[in-house]
């Protein structure tokens, strides 16, 4: 237990300081990879290592939170359904799309229903 305590840096996230405000993770080079995040609490400051994934799609990552509508009906022609998301919250430096459209394949059940509906329309 003592060892664990020693590992907590004085003034760090585990100390008595109540409210730490953490800045964004800034990669040391280029746009992604290992970097640092700076935190402040009163007169104390601390830098912690962090990582920005290199394979993310920024506008769909955790940097951008969206409020989504319900899924639309299955499109029998494409076998997919769509829903739209409106930006709810973005990390301060994240350049998020205001609205996004997400597509996914219909489940076999929904596909069958869509096909049946299409067939009825043709009769």
């Amino acid at each position: 237990v003592a060892k664990k305590k020693d590992k907590v840096k004085k003034g760090g996230p585990g100390s008595e300081c109540a409210e730490w405000a953490w800045g964004p993770c800034t990669p040391s080079s280029k746009d992604c990879g290992v970097g640092f995040r700076e935190g402040t609490c009163g007169a104390q400051t601390q830098r912690i290592r962090c990582r920005v994934p290199c394979n993310w799609k920024k506008e769909f990552g955790a940097d951008c939170k969206y409020k989504f509508e319900n899924w639309g009906a299955c499109d029998g022609g494409t076998g997919t359904k769509v829903r739209q998301g409106t930006l709810k919250k973005a990390r301060y430096n994240a350049q998020c799309q205001e609205t996004i459209r997400v597509t996914k394949p219909c489940t076999p059940k929904t596909k069958a229903k869509a096909k049946a509906k299409k067939g009825k329309g043709k009769d």
Epitope: T26, E38, T40, T86, A90, Y92, Q95
Partner: antibody
Framework: QVQLVQSGAEVKKPGASVKVSCKAS????????MNWVRQAPGQGLEWIGM????????ILNQKFKDKATLTVDISTSTAYMELSSLRSEDTAVYYC??????????WGQGTLVTVSS | EIVLTQSPATLSLSPGERANLSCRAS??????LHWYQQKPHQAPRLLIK???QSISGIPARFSGSGPGTDFNLTISSVEPEDFAVYYC?????????FGGGTKLEIK
């Protein structure tokens, strides 16, 4: 476009409090960080803090932690900043600005708060 | 906190000349640096975001460079309406901070 309209100028006595409002119209108020910045007469710009209307997450400049309180009312698309224990050094123009990393920002016209006995 | 140092404090130029304004950060801030113009009795206006990204409605004569610790705002050919105070601001870590400003005045 987002339009931000701030409340009018205020004259307050030392020790008093003041609440400045910033009403947004146009694009979605709740999606963007609202910053508050002050500018003392003849001086530069100083960041007070910011609040996100979607969940009221607030990040304050530690210098203003005992001075400023930031709130929002989503139903009226209005952000508020209350300043307490006013002193003559708090005399300044206070600005709100709505920030989007993608499109940039929009600023209110500023509210002059004068603290004088 | 990150300190931004702007130079020169005052820049005297004639219309048509090229303006180079500098902003130096006390540590690396990636490209999280923005430039504002402020005229008397007006709110600041964003000119450039993220070191070099242009803003809709801002004339093409304004351009920015970075990233890292040394940033520049360039006005390729100064127009009479460009005489104002220019501030840089960083959004790399809290608190957000502004530089002290550069006043661009008519020579």
């Amino acid at each position: 476009q987002v339009q931000l309209v701030q409340s009018g100028a205020e004259v307050k006595k030392p020790g008093a409090s003041v609440k400045v409002s910033c009403k947004a119209s146009g694009q979605s108020f709740s999606s963007y960080w609202m910053n508050w910045v002050r500018q003392a007469p003849g001086q530069g710009l100083e960041w007070i803090g910011m609040i996100h209307p979607s969940d009221s997450e607030t990040i304050l400049n530690q210098k203003f932690k005992d001075k400023a309180t930031l709130t929002v009312d989503i139903s009226t698309s209005t952000a508020y900043m209350e300043l307490s224990s006013l002193r003559s050094e708090d005399t300044a123009v206070y600005y709100c600005s709505s920030w989007s990393a993608k499109r940039g920002d929009f600023w209110g016209q500023g509210t002059l708060v004068t603290v004088s006995s | 906190e990150i300190v931004l140092t702007q130079s020169p404090a005052t820049l005297s130029l004639s219309p048509g000349e090229r303006a180079n304004l500098s902003c130096r950060a006390s540590e690396s801030i990636s490209n999280n640096l923005h430039w504002y113009q402020q005229k008397p009795h007006q709110a600041p206006r964003l000119l450039i975001k993220y070191a070099s990204q242009s803003i809709s409605g801002i004339p093409a004569r304004f351009s920015g460079s970075g990233p890292g610790t040394d940033f520049n705002l360039t006005i390729s050919s100064v127009e009479p309406e460009d005489f104002a105070v220019y501030y840089c601001q960083q959004s790399n870590s809290w608190p957000l901070t502004f530089g002290g400003g550069t006043k661009l005045e008519i020579k």
